[in-house]
Interface confidence: low
């Protein structure tokens, strides 16, 4: 005897936006206001996230998806799904464990977030420093002395550094 029918969870037919209501003989009931279910077969709906205080609403909650928050001006998101807002710093600073601090000499940050990065070392490419770096800007590398013959190419700016950002996960 071959079993041709697998036992099916009676809740598996409930689509996203509903929940399997055990109080009503496992009928699929719509999620109540301010709640959602993003997948089918849910026993309950999840409470919608509320974007309050330093958080602001980027996307409203629907019956099938949670609200999405971002941060008010002066702050930026941290963590999966913007679970926290971290204060911005000024260009030329980085947020340390104890607050915004100026970049050390020899480093720069041209963003309001992220970490200070070392100035480009022009000499590694056989070039010279054309414009000195600051806390806010990288150095600009110029042609090497050998390149200063007639017909030499013009100034080469350093390749843009990747924004490291924060990675709490």
């Amino acid at each position: 005897f071959e079993r041709t029918r697998s036992l099916q969870d009676p809740c598996s037919n409930c689509p996203a936006g509903t929940f399997c209501d055990n109080n009503r003989n496992q009928i699929c009931s719509p999620c109540p206001p301010n709640s959602f279910s993003s997948a089918g077969g849910q026993r309950t709906c999840d409470i919608c996230r509320q974007c309050k205080g330093v958080f602001r609403t980027r996307k409203e909650c629907s019956s099938t998806s949670n609200a999405e928050c971002d941060c008010t001006p002066g702050f930026h998101c941290l963590g999966a799904g913007c679970s926290m807002c971290e204060q911005d710093c000024k260009q030329g600073q980085e947020l340390t464990k104890k607050g915004c601090k100026d970049c050390c000499f020899g480093t720069f940050n041209d963003q309001k977030r992220g970490i200070c990065r070392p100035w480009t070392n022009c000499s590694l490419d056989g070039k010279s420093v054309l414009v000195n770096g600051t806390k806010e800007r990288d150095v600009v590398c110029g042609p090497s002395p050998a390149d200063l013959s007639p017909g030499a190419s013009s100034v080469t700016p350093p390749a843009p550094a990747r924004e490291p950002g924060h990675s709490p996960q």
Partner: antibody
Framework: EVQLVESGGGLVQPGGSLRLSCAAS????????ISWVRQAPGKGLEWVAI???????DYARSAKGRFTISRDNSKNTLYLQMNSLRAEDTAVYYC????????????WGQGTLVTVSS | DIQMTQSPSSLSASVGDRVTITCQSS????????LAWYQQKPGKVPKLLIY???TLASGVPSRFSGSGSGTDFTLTISSLQPEDVATYYC???????????FGGGTKVEIK
Amino acid sequence: EVQLVESGGGLVQPGGSLRLSCAASGFSLNNNAISWVRQAPGKGLEWVAIIQNTGTTDYARSAKGRFTISRDNSKNTLYLQMNSLRAEDTAVYYCARGYGFESELVIWGQGTLVTVSS
Amino acid sequence: DIQMTQSPSSLSASVGDRVTITCQSSQSVYNNNALAWYQQKPGKVPKLLIYLASTLASGVPSRFSGSGSGTDFTLTISSLQPEDVATYYCLGVYNDDVDNGFGGGTKVEIK
């Protein structure tokens, strides 16, 4: 699921040593600042030590010279080596993960009890 | 040593009351705002309520608010609820050569 689980607590005699572990899951320890915080029975919270994502460490005066915080990135585990233990070190020890500032301890383990007694 | 003085040490209030807890530090916290508030219910681990002195942590009810700067900080519960029965702690962060410090805690009960 993001969580921290402490272990290694127990009964130890004064002057003895103990190593607490804090296993992380759902995130990488080496990308986060992790603190140890303790709470003596019926008392308040006391900050003990921190290791930054850079590996920089910092200790409370009560822990300096006796406790060492470290981590093993391959095991995604944090440690607190406690030497020269005293009766006043008796407490539940929590590890906690922070963001940005040290004061923002967002995720806490369930704690492990250390009892120092003869 | 820096003292983080939290007051009162305990209080009893009615449901719906406005409750205020203060933390006073003998030295300014870093950046004047590196202070957080935690809630610890009996037998549970602490939970972050407020960070950067006044920023509400994710998922925390809006009846909780924080204010203050430098050395003086306040946690306010605008309308006390039965589920707010807990002990509340502040935690300040200081310059590199100074210990981070918790306040002594405030036990909140319902009348």
